[in-house]
């Protein structure tokens, strides 16, 4: 009878994970009597996977009817298959003995499992950033096989170029991790604006993987102040505003002063929202002329998202007021800290 | 149903022949190394021959030169031919199959008793 | 030849008790050793195989152990139909040898 020969059919066999794979194995003699086992890689270190002799093996099962000695199909399956499953499995056949001894091994079955990337995370930098400079967005993928992989960014549905992509580890592994660094230009108009990261892999089947990242978490949009006067009913009375414009985000403090001295603060409350994300906002003091000898100096002075405070100042000539005494007839003090000026906001 | 029904045993006279049979049902015979076991009254048990599925012989040192083994495929039948018998031989002669991949003895027939004796 | 020794040779129990049977081979048999029982006038029964694996049908209160030379069969609770006679069994190697037989009486 010829010597018996193990046969390993398939060179390669490609799994998903959490399938099952089958491994064919076929000997072509019944002779020498001995066990058949099965191993993931070779040499001292090779793992025992299933052993026709003895042991537990849960997720093992025979794929031909193993009760009958003219049987010579030791295939099996490995059922709920993940990447750290991946290798080179050895069919050998063994000779009965003390110890048994290894008679004839197959060449081996590269199992390689198809694991799908992770959902991508993107995240961006710290600290918000203002428009026109260029910041820094993140995006990760993991434990997805093969290594073979797509990355992409967009802005608003606008590719993007500037970015760099790294795949590891760079040698072989039972999963890789992707993970790349997108650099993006801010610009006033990008408190709507999204950054999505898009993963493409074979085992997405043309479906890619979507991260993303709202810019109105990254950018901070500075406001532009305008203070203006306008003569109210009385002669004597002036309505100075403040104009806060295209600020984001909302967090903003405003202070009035009177000649450098605090008149008052408030915080940003009723504002109203620009079709482009950002915020306006409007403060007014009532100023009663009469009052003062000199010309006033107001100040407008805007604390922005803890940023250091700007300031848009404006002169009250007083002169231009006749000065009527005991005109000040204040019945409530609106937060001022003198009598004579009055204020809001809207 | 997998069977082993056995055959040809009876009385004779020390020194003369038999020959056992041993009809197989419900597997195929030749996939299967085979054995013949004996147990002499009130002893134990006692392997005597062993046929492997390539044809490869094996005996007891008691038996060899004497009995010969051999398997008919066609008939699915496995024989112990029993030459220069002996009084010693006297036992209940069993046929068994040895296992799926290890030959661990899994069936057994019922026996047939063989006696030498003058 | 590998020599195949048995003890006790008899062994007296009750229903339900617990029994072990030990087996010593003179050399290393790896795990080659079946366990049979034998009733009077009947052809022995196949119970285990490669030490610890159970054939078709035995029941569970059977167990084998061991590896090497030294090997035990354990029936955890006797029922009157397991008073039988029982043999370990080397098949490493020809001559496959048995144990001279356990006879297991009720007490």
């Known amino acids: 009878e010829e010597e018996l020969q193990v046969i390993q059919p398939d060179k390669s066999v490609s799994v998903a994970a959490g399938e099952s794979a089958i491994l064919h194995c076929t000997v072509t003699s019944l002779i020498p009597v001995g066990p058949i086992q099965w191993f993931r890689g070779a040499g001292p270190a090779r793992e025992l996977i299933y052993n026709q002799k003895e042991g537990h093996f849960p997720r093992v099962t025979t794929v031909s009817e193993s009760t009958k000695r003219e049987n010579m199909d030791f295939s099996i399956s490995i059922s709920n298959i993940t990447p750290a499953d991946a290798g080179t499995y050895y069919c050998v056949k063994f000779r009965k003995g003390s110890p048994d001894t290894e008679f004839k091994s197959g060449a081996g079955t590269e199992l390689s499992v198809r694991a799908k990337p992770s959902a991508p995370v993107v995240s961006g930098p710290a600290a918000r950033a203002t428009p026109q400079h260029t910041v820094s967005f993140t995006c990760e993928s993991h434990g997805f096989s093969p290594r073979d992989i797509t990355l992409k960014w967009f802005k608003n549905g606008n590719e993007l170029s500037d970015f760099q992509t790294n795949v590891d580890p760079v040698g072989e592994s039972v999963s890789y991790s992707i993970h790349s660094t997108a650099k993006v230009v801010l610009t006033r108009e990008d408190v709507h604006s999204q950054v999505i990261c898009e993963v493409a892999h074979v085992t997405l089947q043309g479906d890619p993987l979507r991260g993303t990242a709202n810019l109105s978490e990254t950018i901070r949009v500075p406001p532009t102040l305008e203070v203006t006067q306008q003569p109210v009913r009385a002669e004597n009375q002036v309505n100075v505003t403040c104009q806060v414009r295209k600020f984001y985000p909302q967090r903003l403090q405003l202070t009035w002063l009177e000649n450098g001295n605090v008149s008052r603060t408030e915080t940003a409350s009723t504002v109203t929202e620009n079709k482009d994300g950002t915020y306006n906002w409007m403060s007014w003091l009532l100023v009663n002329v009469s009052a003062h000898r000199d010309d006033v100096k107001l100040t407008c002075q805007v604390e922005h998202d803890g940023q250091p405070a700007v300031s848009k100042s404006h002169d009250l000539k007083v002169s231009a007021h006749p000065k009527e005494q005991g005109s000040n007839t204040a019945a409530e003090n609106t937060g001022s800290n003198e009598r004579n000026i009055y204020g809001g906001s809207g | 149903e997998v069977q082993l029904v056995e055959s040809g045993g009876g009385l004779v006279q020390p020194g003369g022949s038999l020959r056992l049979s041993c009809a197989a049902s419900?597997?195929?015979?030749?996939?299967?190394?085979m054995h013949w076991v004996r147990q002499a009254p009130g002893k134990g048990l006692e392997w005597v021959s062993a046929?492997?599925?390539?044809?490869?012989?094996y005996y007891t040192g008691s038996v060899k030169g004497r009995f010969t083994i051999s398997r008919e495929n066609a008939k699915n039948s496995l024989y112990l031919q029993m030459n220069s018998l002996r009084a010693s031989d006297t036992a209940v002669y069993y046929c068994v199959r040895g296992g799926v991949w290890d030959d661990a003895f899994d069936i057994w027939g019922q026996g047939t008793m063989v006696t030498v004796s003058s | 030849d590998i020599q195949m020794t048995q003890s006790p040779s008899s062994l007296s129990a009750s229903v339900g008790d617990r029994v072990t049977i030990t087996c010593r081979a003179s050399q290393d048999i790896n795990n080659y050793l079946a366990w049979f029982q034998q009733k009077p006038g009947k052809a022995p029964k196949s119970l285990i195989y490669t030490a610890s694996s159970l054939h078709s049908g035995v029941p569970s209160k059977f167990s084998g152990s061991g590896s090497g030379t030294d090997f035990t069969l354990t029936i955890s609770s006797l029922q009157p139909e397991d008073f039988a006679t029982y043999y370990c069994q080397q098949y490493v190697s020809y001559p496959y040898t048995f144990g001279q037989g356990t006879k297991l009486e009720i007490k």
């Open positions: 419900g597997f195929t015979l030749s996939s299967y190394d």
């Open positions: 046929i492997g599925t390539a044809g490869d012989t």
